[in-house]
Interface confidence: low
């Protein structure tokens, strides 16, 4: 539909509250360093302008595109040049180049202070004093730290954040009520951000076709009773939604996501039997629920895939007539039969099938050539199965912290050029796959584990892209989206790496470590472990374990000492000397 005023159209569709929240998210995701008050001022100006357009769509500038209106507003920020440097050059460009330029300057690892949680009473007072500002600040702080956070989903998080404070600030024990809820929102938020980051990377780095293939596989697993045409329609609509959100078109994205949820609920009989509860919820909860809904049961008596995709004499004819449609059907049929496979595995199988048809349909006897194509799938299926089995056994043997340490050592040896904070963050997240997925039965382990690992490895890829230091990381990240995990798994110790110079300062610790939370103390120890491996990449597991055990004992001893700082200084020197001797540094 062509609307005389796009801004009026979206304001009317979304309502003032959601409109303002989404504009704030959009601005904070673009200008990540700007103070909160500046963003609120810009949002209020845009909102007032939108209201004039609702009143009269023919009013001056109301016919301008949202990118033009928002870009013009962002480019009024006085400190753009000194705060953002070359990003200010974007303002010299015309749309759509200007928006593309802003997108390219989004920073996955902005230099912002860590969010420190104030005392519960302080938070409750702030919440009661000005609820609207309190909630806007939440949107702003999350959006600027996560510039690809899925905006309509952030509205859902904000709704839960508000509900937590509304309930807990009047509870007898405010902290006992509130803190677990905030921890849960924080952890879920990080996971949601990382999942969306992979969707945006998929679209931006590998194109719409790659994203659509992912969506066909995932939706076919989730809705195995739906017809191929229905799945295709959902994939097209979902691709539009995510393309918009990843492109900074947050008002359109939220609007289209609401339309998609409405369509799914109106047509649930032909989509899935699991949607009933979701469809009874209000909009934000409904959309979230649909996105997380469990897989429907597979239809009984599905015929063998071989008939249509191997035995039929029309395989090459069907493939030649409409390659992507035929491959889409293959992916749909395979995925709906295999909820036990990861999406990336299904995509590898589809790629193998495509490669085989490309080769065989040009051969003298195509059928003879592709007759054994399904046999090629066996090793592709067994590789992740074996890897997950081995790693879950290791996780069960070691527990999460030590399993993370094993991965830290493994990945530091593979790609030692990567920064220590990135290696720690990524390896800790890789290690969480154990507690997240190993508890599941065999049939759910692979989709849980391998698709989660894809999300975590994408974090490594986007962080590395900002400051590329390793050809091996660049290679694994850019060659193939679906083969990233096998590519990293296949990496051996980097023999070309020149060990880092030993620096005693890196291994000097102070009494402040004693007041840290258990998680922060683990991160300190894991940081030291990465640095050790960078100094001594050929160190054995046993040598590293001995040094880390000594280190843990040293921290425990000094944290119990009366004069902690002196203990850290004196015992620290001894520890460094002993570690150097043990590792031959």
């Amino acid at each position: 539909d062509a609307h005389k005023s796009e801004v009026a159209h979206r304001f009317k569709d979304l309502g003032e509250e959601n409109f303002k929240a989404l504009v704030l998210i959009a601005f904070a995701q673009y200008l990540q360093q700007c103070p909160f008050e500046d963003h609120v001022k810009l949002v209020n100006e845009v909102t007032e302008f939108a209201k004039t357009c609702v009143a009269d769509e023919s009013a001056e500038n109301c016919d301008k595109s949202l990118h033009t209106l928002f870009g013009d507003k962002l480019c009024t920020v006085a400190t753009l040049r000194e705060t953002y440097g070359e990003m200010a050059d974007c303002c010299a460009k015309q749309e759509p180049e200007r928006n593309e330029c802003f997108l390219q300057h989004k920073d996955d690892n902005p230099n912002l202070p860590r969010l420190v949680r104030p005392e519960v009473d302080v938070m409750c007072t702030a919440f009661h004093d000005n609820e609207e500002t309190f909630l806007k600040k939440y949107l702003y702080e999350i959006a600027r730290r996560h510039p690809y956070f899925y905006a309509p989903e952030l509205l859902f998080f904000a709704k839960r954040y508000k509900a937590a404070f509304t309930e807990c600030c009047q509870a007898a024990d405010k902290a006992a009520c509130l803190l677990p809820k905030l921890d849960e929102l924080r952890d879920e938020g990080k996971a949601s951000s990382a999942k969306q980051r992979l969707k945006c990377a998929s679209l931006q780095k590998f194109g719409e076709r790659a994203f659509k293939a992912w969506a066909v596989a995932r939706l076919s697993q989730r809705f195995p009773k739906a017809e191929f045409a229905e799945v295709s329609k959902l994939v097209t609509d979902l691709t539009k939604v995510h393309t918009e959100c990843c492109h900074g078109d947050l008002l359109e994205c939220a609007d289209d996501r609401a339309d998609l949820a409405k369509y799914i609920c109106e047509n649930q009989d032909s989509i899935s039997s699991k949607l009933k509860e979701c469809c009874e919820k209000p909009l934000l909860e409904k959309s979230h629920c649909i996105a997380e809904v469990e897989n429907d049961e597979m239809p009984a008596d599905l015929p063998s895939l071989a008939a249509d995709f191997v035995e039929s004499k029309d395989v090459c004819k069907n493939y030649a007539e409409a390659k992507d449609v035929f491959l889409g059907m293959f992916l749909y049929e395979y995925a709906r039969r295999h909820p036990d496979y990861s999406v990336v595995l299904l995509l590898r199988l589809a790629k193998t099938y495509e490669t085989t048809l490309e080769k065989c349909c040009a051969a003298a006897d195509p059928h003879e050539c592709y007759a054994k194509v399904f046999d090629e799938f066996k090793p592709l299926v067994e590789e992740p199965q074996n890897l997950i089995k081995q790693n879950c056994e290791l996780f069960e043997q070691l527990g999460e912290y030590k399993f993370q340490n094993a991965l830290l050592v493994r990945y530091t040896k593979k790609v030692p050029q990567v920064s220590t904070p990135t290696l720690v963050e990524v390896s800790r997240n890789l290690g969480k796959v154990g507690s997240k997925c190993c508890k599941h039965p065999e049939a759910k382990r692979m989709p849980c584990a391998e698709d989660y690992l894809s999300v975590v490895l994408n974090q490594l890829c986007v962080l590395h892209e900002k400051t590329p230091v390793s050809d091996r990381v660049t290679k694994c990240c850019t060659e193939s989206l679906v083969n990233r995990r096998p590519c990293f798994s296949a990496l051996e110790v980097d023999e070309t790496y020149v060990p880092k110079e030993f620096n005693a300062e890196t291994f000097t610790f102070h009494a402040d470590i004693c007041t840290l939370s258990e998680k922060e103390r683990q991160i300190k120890k894991q940081t030291a472990l990465v640095e050790l491996v960078k100094h001594k990449p050929k160190a054995t597991k046993e040598q590293l374990k001995a040094v880390m055990d000594d280190f843990a004992a040293f921290v425990e001893k000094c944290c119990k000492a009366d004069d902690k700082e002196t203990c850290f200084a004196e015992e620290g020197k001894k520890l460094v000397a002993a570690s150097q001797a043990a590792l031959g540094l």
């Epitope: 780095k205 590998f206 194109g207 076709r209 892209e465 590329p468 660049t474 290679k475 990240c477 850019t478 060659e479 193939s480």
Partner: nanobody
């Protein structure tokens, strides 16, 4: 050792055409997506265009869509950029990169478009 050597740049009048080449060695060229990036002195690199490893999926920056065509010949280990309807604002050093990185790994080739 990974090497990328660009050629084909030069001085051309607005509206004219150039074809840039990038000869690759030291890695499995046919396994990598490739990009063209350009840089004006004093400014940051600007991504121009990308192509997947097989040459089937191509992407372009809005500023050059419809004017430039990216292609590759895996047998010759060469990446190409056909530049038509050149404008003065296309003046820059052009260089090719592996994947979609905008980090420079080569010398580049100068393209100057006069008005």
């Amino acid at each position: 050792e990974v090497q990328l050597v660009e050629s084909g740049g030069g001085l051309v009048q607005a509206g004219g055409s150039l074809r840039l080449s990038c000869a690759a060695s030291g890695f499995t060229f046919g396994s990598f997506g490739m990009s063209w990036v350009r840089q004006v002195p004093g400014k940051g690199p600007e991504w121009v265009s990308a192509i997947d490893s097989g040459g089937t999926d191509t992407r372009y920056a809005e500023s050059i869509k419809g004017r430039f065509i990216i292609s590759r010949d895996n047998a010759k280990k060469t990446l190409y950029l056909q530049m038509n309807s050149l404008k003065p604002e296309d003046t820059a050093v052009y260089y090719c990169t592996i994947g979609q990185s905008t980090s420079r790994g080569s010398q580049g080739t100068q393209v100057t478009v006069s008005s």
